[in-house]
């Protein structure tokens, strides 16, 4: 059977009413029934994925291959889409039965493995409406949600969470750090109908909060009053010069004075050398520039704070979270160094189901994956050590040969002669 699974909204409304699992929130009716699995892809049917995923028609774009990589926990289960060509754009997408997340939770989940020790490349997915032309998906194609890790140079190691709100891509105001090692990691985005969200990595929460607080979807609630301006007599000086203070009469002394101890040299010739002038020295009585004493300003009013008013442009939106139509999941990426593997895609309305699915896929193979990698690393270390030893041995042998060549030739004697010689000497 195909490993792509598409189901519909779960049970009918009657079942849900009977089960009394109804919750109200800000005029949105939402429910928890049976989990709806809108999209699931584990690449368990060999080349079957090629009929479900559509590539952009452009010759210079990178190719995805099905692979479990250089190390894995389970060679079959860990097969996923791997980027295979360096310094390329990638564009691949799969469609599913269109759905809306209005009135219900949305969960987007997948695994990413940057086994190439990535320097710059995306590991994120985009969720598009079903109006997307999959053969022409590109960086500017309008999407609903973009989610997942992105690494580029030392400055970017983040999880993007971007929502298209009223035609604009709005970036999260928080910095969520992604994993940058070579192992498989599970990324989960949960968007709830109460306009809250949660981001999980490896089934552990790394960020959560409210959509309105953590994105700039709406204008600010308060703005500076455009009709207010600082009064002209507003005094912001905390200290002022003391008007009663005056400069002492003996204050002004020159900074430098002629050295009173200096004497004209005896051989000084005024006709030849000109008029003798004593060298100048720092005046010990010089007091510098006089500044009046500072006192508290009796008219000080503090720093003027621009008064704020309610922003007439602000109005709350209880349906920020909601999209009318999801129909395509796409990988629209750039990778400098290829080798990333994407697997275990899931779009559902059930948080618990997603967590369970994560534990049954990523959770089951992660330890064995690490073991295989550690074993490979150990073998590599051993090989490296062996190579180093061999190299050292070769170098010693070469040195010995060189020494032999350089040393003066000795007359050859038979073993017997040499031994006898030794005995006699002893």
């Amino acid at each position: 059977s195909s490993s792509l699974e598409v189901l519909f909204q779960g049970p009918g409304l009657n079942d849900i009413f009977e089960a009394q699992k109804i919750e109200w929130h800000e005029e949105n009716l939402y429910f928890q029934g049976e989990p709806a699995v809108y999209f699931k892809e584990q690449f368990l049917d060999g080349d079957g994925w090629t009929s479900r995923w559509i590539e952009k028609h452009k010759s210079d774009f990178g190719k995805f291959v099905l692979s479990s990589g250089k190390f894995y926990g389970d060679e079959e289960k860990d097969k996923g889409l791997q980027t295979s060509q360096d310094a390329r754009f990638y564009a691949l997408s799969a469609s599913f039965e269109p759905f809306s997340n209005k009135g219900q939770t949305l969960v987007v989940q997948f695994t990413v493995k940057h086994e190439q020790n990535i320097d710059c490349g995306g590991g994120y997915v985009k969720l598009f409406p079903n109006s997307l032309d999959q053969t022409d998906m590109h960086g500017d194609s309008e999407y609903n949600i973009m989610f997942g890790p992105d690494i580029c140079g030392p400055g970017t190691k983040k999880v993007h969470v971007i929502f298209n709100y009223k035609g604009k891509n709005v970036l999260i105001n928080k910095d969520i750090r992604c994993k940058d090692d070579e192992f498989t990691h599970l990324y989960t985005l949960i968007v709830r109908p109460d306009n809250t969200y949660e981001v999980k990595i490896d089934n552990s929460q790394v960020e959560s909060g409210s959509l309105e607080d953590d994105w700039d979807f709406l204008p600010p609630k308060k703005i500076k009053d455009p009709d207010a301006s600082k009064p002209e007599d507003w005094d912001e000086r905390a200290k002022i010069d003391d008007p009663t203070d005056s400069k002492p009469e003996d204050w002004d002394k020159p900074e430098h004075i002629p050295d009173p101890d200096a004497k004209k040299p005896e051989d000084w010739d005024e006709e030849m050398d000109g008029e003798w002038e004593p060298p100048v020295i720092q005046n010990p009585e010089y007091k510098g520039e006089w500044k009046p004493r500072q006192i508290d300003n009796p008219d000080y009013k503090g720093t003027w704070i621009h008064p704020e008013i309610d922003n007439p442009e602000y109005s709350p939106d209880p349906s920020i979270y909601a999209y009318d139509n999801f129909g395509v999941l796409g990988l629209d990426l750039w990778q400098v160094k290829s080798g990333t593997i994407f697997d275990n895609f899931l779009i559902t309305n059930d948080e618990a189901y997603a967590e369970e699915f994560g534990n049954e896929t990523w959770g089951v193979t992660k330890a064995a994956e690490k073991q295989m990698k550690d074993k490979q690393d150990e073998e590599q270390r051993t090989r490296r050590m062996m190579r180093t030893k061999m190299r050292m041995r070769r170098m010693r042998r070469t040195r010995r040969k060189m020494r032999r060549k350089m040393s003066p030739a000795r007359p050859r004697t038979s073993c017997r002669e040499a031994c006898l010689q030794g005995w006699t000497e002893a």
């Epitope: 310094a87 710059c120 490349g121 500017d140 580029c152 009223k166 604009k168 700039d216 600010p220 400098v336």
Partner: antibody, heavy 127, light 107 residues
Framework: EVQLVQSGAEVKKPGSSVKVSCKAS????????ISWVRQAPGQGLEWMGG????????NYAQKFQGRVTITADESTSTAYMELSSLRSEDTAVYYC????????????????????WGQGTTVTVSS | SYVLTQPPSVSAAPGKTARISCGGN??????VHWYQQKAGQAPVLVIY???KRPSGIPERFSGSNSGNTATLTISGTQAMDEADYYC?????????FGGGTKLTVLG
């Protein structure tokens, strides 16, 4: 924070080419995208194109396509802009400007604006 | 190609609020940045992503973006704010600048 220092003023004949350099210091060159923007006397700002050194690929404004080449040398942390077939209308101050690279897509750094600018290089095209 | 339209000039009295508009078709779907350029100097980024202020930019600078107009607001305008101001957006793999607005601080 990165600083950008551009090469000196140039006087060129119509039909010739000019190559302006922009050396970055005080930051990791591969963490930025570099744009080239010009400003003719008394006129506004005009974007010519940009490059992401870590990608090694450049993109250009339609108007300059085929006449401008933007390159980057990571070993010297220097970006270059070469404009060929010069005409008198190309007389302008040419600026390089950097945007922090906040992701692996072409569009990422354009979400953040050009936050550091070079001092500008005056190019005069005159016969 | 995408066009950003700015008024050639705007004036404000010291301490008052100055507003500079930047019009573009459905501009609210774009991320708009604003630059200040004083005579003989390179531009300086004063607002990015519609309304965010880079560090070192005074609080009196703010930005908004809705419908077909993005706006740079300078509240409590000071003489030192006299400069040219440019809006900028990104469209179809291209950076687009507005034509620029000269802000004159009166008196």
């Amino acid at each position: 924070e990165v600083q950008l220092v551009q090469s000196g003023a140039e006087v060129k004949k119509p039909g010739s080419s000019v190559k302006v350099s922009c050396k970055a210091s005080g930051g990791t060159f591969s963490s930025y995208a570099i744009s080239w923007v010009r400003q003719a006397p008394g006129q506004g700002l005009e974007w010519m194109g940009g490059i992401i050194p870590i990608f090694g690929t450049a993109n250009y404004a339609q108007k300059f396509q085929g006449r401008v080449t933007i390159t980057a040398d990571e070993s010297t942390s220097t970006a270059y802009m070469e404009l060929s077939s010069l005409r008198s209308e190309d007389t302008a101050v040419y600026y390089c400007a950097s945007s922090p690279l906040r992701g692996s897509g072409w569009y990422w750094h354009y979400y953040y604006g050009m936050d550091v600018w070079g001092q500008g290089t005056t190019v005069t095209v005159s016969s | 190609s995408y066009v950003l339209t700015q008024p050639p000039s705007v004036s404000a009295a010291p301490g008052k609020t100055a507003r500079i508009s930047c019009g573009g078709n459905n501009i609210r779907s774009k991320s708009v940045h604003w630059y200040q350029q004083k005579a003989g100097q390179a531009p300086v980024l004063v607002i990015y992503q519609d309304s965010k202020r880079p560090s070192g930019i005074p609080e009196r600078f703010s930005g908004s973006n809705s419908g077909n107009t993005a706006t740079l607001t300078i509240s409590g305008t000071q003489a030192m704010d006299e400069a040219d101001y440019y809006c900028q957006a990104w469209d179809s793999n291209t950076v687009v600048f507005g034509g620029g607005t000269k802000l004159t601080v009166l008196g």
